[in-house]
């Protein structure tokens, strides 16, 4: 089955510059399929922009200036690139790559989409470091004792742009754990967001990781925030009457 | 030009109560196209749900049902037993891939329908309230309450800043909430919650301990940048 990954969750550009958005295709040979690019502007319908077919033929949507978008395909890295020229405010949108994926049954196809890249246009120069700054909160003793569970909270502050993805994993496991999160909030010129994870008592002695994807992470890799194991056996309790 | 128009911009649904989304086609006969449905969840993930001819995305067949009403020129998507995971924006889209002749393999989308999920009506439940701290940062965790209306107050004489609470549906179908703030005297901050005409304090849940083993790390400690993406 074809799978699409868009490594950039956001791309921030200044006016009239060129933006390049990437889409990595796996599970299918990129030179044996067509890759499509769509955009979703705020409050508008998702619109087809351009496609590159298996034989390299490029098709551009007729209602859009032909020089605005360019599409490329690099078989060696199994990547398709959408180039957006001369970026302007009207180009603020989420850009999705997509492909038709054949189902097991002959003749049945579905179009699958990548996770999208949000193009952000800014006219201000921000501080050098606008990556998310983490603060960790460990479970309160009261919660672990009374509820036989513990909540970890991962606070991320002073980041720009506002596009951020947070998920949680247990150490030595690639399973994404069910977490909850607040809305992204504006604080002066930057943003903050928090996410929390509640785990049962039996998991409190394991290390947990809050994994953060952001455009301005150092070296362009996901930031991993380590939550150490919690010792619950050393606590005696005498809860007040409820 | 062909246009796909959703019946509603927003559809509130209750957990477990079936819901129906409709999308009408303007300017063309719906029978000349294949209809698709997608869901966009938080973080912009666009997931395929259904395509005409009984094709469902992984994990959707049991809880979703797609249909076409040729007479009314509209597409229908039923969510048979909604859960909190079904919250998101739902899009209908059409194409003519494989119909022969001058086919188009691009999708034409309609505007999204925002589906908001609410817990089903249930007996009122009082929240548990816990405080978590790190440096000047304080978080008030409010767990497992119903109904949704709640006021969370972090009590301090030296407030730096406070943020609006996040209120979400818990896995058990009630509500959870977190309110964050920064305070100069974070050690003395407590949390009081007004819910269902009652007040619940974090101090009601405090425990006595003989240990300092359960410690908090310093701010921004335990952060690493791995080599893998």
């Amino acid at each position: 089955a074809g799978h699409l990954e868009q490594p950039q969750i956001s791309s921030t550009k200044t006016l009239s510059k060129t933006a390049r958005l990437e889409c990595v295709v796996s599970g299918i040979t990129i030179s044996a399929t067509s890759v499509y690019w769509y955009r979703e502007r705020p409050g508008e319908v998702i619109q087809f922009l351009v496609s590159i077919s298996y034989d390299g033929t490029v098709r551009k949507e007729s209602g859009i200036p032909s020089g605005k978008f360019e599409v490329d395909r690099i078989p060696e890295t199994s990547t398709s690139t959408l180039t957006i020229h001369n970026v302007e405010k009207q180009d603020i949108a989420t850009y999705y790559c997509a492909l038709w994926e054949a189902q097991q049954e002959l003749g049945k196809k579905i179009k699958v989409f990548g996770p999208g890249t949000k193009l952000i246009i800014t006219d201000k120069q921000l501080d050098a470091d606008v990556s998310p700054k983490p603060t960790i909160f460990l479970p309160s003793i009261a919660e672990t004792k009374l509820q036989k569970a513990g909540t970890y909270l991962c606070l991320l502050e002073k980041f720009f742009p506002d596009v951020i993805k947070i998920h949680w994993e247990e150490k030595k496991s690639n399973t994404i754990l069910g977490s909850q999160e607040g809305n992204t909030m504006k604080t002066n010129d930057t943003y903050m967001k928090f996410s929390w994870l509640t785990v049962p008592e039996k998991s409190l002695d394991k290390e947990h990781r809050c994994i953060v994807r952001h455009e301005n992470n150092k070296n362009g890799v996901d930031q991993e925030i380590i939550f150490p194991p919690i010792k619950t056996d050393v606590i005696t309790m005498d809860p007040k009457d409820n | 030009a062909i246009e796909l128009v959703p019946e509603h911009q927003t559809v509130p649904v209750s957990i477990g109560v079936p819901a129906t989304l409709r999308c009408s086609m303007k300017g063309e006969a719906i029978g000349n196209y294949y209809i698709n449905w997608y869901r966009k969840t938080q973080g912009n993930t666009m997931t395929f749900i259904y395509r005409e001819k009984d094709i469902y995305g992984p994990g959707f067949k049991d809880n979703f049902q797609g249909d076409i009403d040729i007479a009314k020129n509209l597409a229908v998507l039923k969510i048979l037993a909604p859960s909190e995971r079904d919250e998101g924006s739902y899009y209908c889209a059409c194409d003519t891939l494989g119909m022969g002749g001058e086919y188009t393999d691009k999708l034409i989308f309609g505007k999204g329908t925002r589906v908001t999920v609410e817990p089903r009506s249930q007996p009122h439940t009082k929240p548990s309230v816990f405080v978590m701290k790190n440096g000047t940062n304080v978080a008030c965790l409010v767990k497992e309450f119903y109904p949704k209306d709640i006021r969370i107050n972090l009590v301090s004489s030296k407030k730096i800043t406070e943020f609006d609470p996040a209120i979400v549906i818990s896995p058990s179908g009630k509500y959870n909430a977190v309110k964050l703030g920064k305070y100069e005297d974070s050690n003395s901050v407590t949390c009081s919650v007004q819910h269902d005409n009652k007040t619940v304090h974090s101090t009601d849940f405090e425990v006595k301990t003989d240990s300092t083993d359960h410690v908090k790390p310093k701010e921004t400690e335990n952060t690493k940048q791995p080599s893998k993406s």
């Epitope: 060129t18 590159i52 390299g56 490029v58 007729s62 859009i64 200036p65 032909s66 020089g67 605005k68 360019e70 599409v71 490329d72 395909r73 690139t81 180039t83 020229h85 001369n86 302007e88 009207q90 | -």
Partner: antibody
Framework: QVQLVQSGAEVKKPGASVKVSCKAS????????INWVRQATGQGLEWMGQ????????YYNQKFKGRVTMTRDTSISTAYMELSSLRSEDTAVYYC???????????WGQGTSVTVSS | DIVMTQSPDSLAVSLGERATINCKSS????????????LAWYQQKPGQPPKLLIY???TRESGVPDRFSGSGSGTDFTLTISSLQAEDVAVYYC????????FGTGTKLEIK
């Protein structure tokens, strides 16, 4: 400064092919489209097509499809236009010209004269 | 394909007088998203490549005298030379760059 330097004049027999080069300097070659426009003596300007050197993608005027091939060599910032099956009505000055994205053509080469005669 | 039609084919104007050249496109070259008309005007003198005068239908290229102005929107456009100078004798072309590129038929401007 921006320069587009084209190869010299060519005289060709009908049925032959001609390949004209266009060397770019003073700008980022891979970020601009290179267009080819021709002009027969006393006639107007006719857009033949364009290449995007960043990807090698080509877009041809329907009239020349099958007869024209546009290529590029990014290592030497040079674009090429080859026109095959030449006939007398292909006698013209051939210009390369650049444009950025959805901006218009803003800079032209000096032109290459191609004469097709038996 | 978008077809560009210019009128008149040729024009003779006295020095210091106004010259007006018209251009019509077979379909709109106005992109509603940015409200820009993808239309340019060029001047070409014998033995030289064309020179860009106006883009976005009305924006003068730097270094172009302000006697040159462009107007119009959608499908109908005009190039105006407010006070003709001897060095303005040339052929003028309109060009759409909304869908690739197409040039107009050209207008030869001479001194009366």
């Amino acid at each position: 400064q921006v320069q587009l330097v084209q190869s010299g004049a060519e005289v060709k027999k009908p049925g032959a092919s001609v390949k004209v080069s266009c060397k770019a300097s003073g700008f980022t070659f891979t970020d601009h489209y290179i267009n080819w426009v021709r002009q027969a003596t006393g006639q107007g300007l006719e857009w033949m097509g364009q290449i995007y050197p960043g990807s090698g993608n080509t877009y041809y005027n329907q009239k020349f499809k099958g007869r024209v091939t546009m290529t590029r060599d990014t290592s030497i910032s040079t674009a090429y236009m080859e026109l095959s099956s030449l006939r007398s009505e292909d006698t013209a000055v051939y210009y390369c010209a650049r444009n950025y994205g959805d901006y218009t053509i803003d800079f032209w080469g000096q032109g290459t004269s191609v004469t097709v005669s038996s | 394909d978008i077809v560009m039609t210019q009128s008149p084919d040729s024009l003779a104007v006295s020095l210091g007088e106004r010259a007006t050249i018209n251009c019509k496109s077979s379909q709109s070259v106005l992109y509603s998203s940015n409200n820009k008309n993808y239309l340019a005007w060029y001047q070409q003198k014998p033995g030289q490549p064309p020179k860009l005068l106006i883009y976005w239908a009305s924006t003068r290229e730097s270094g172009v005298p302000d006697r040159f102005s462009g107007s119009g929107s959608g499908t109908d456009f005009t190039l105006t030379i407010s006070s003709l100078q001897a060095e303005d004798v040339a052929v003028y072309y309109c060009q759409q760059y909304y869908r690739y590129h197409t040039f107009g038929t050209g207008t030869k401007l001479e001194i009366k």
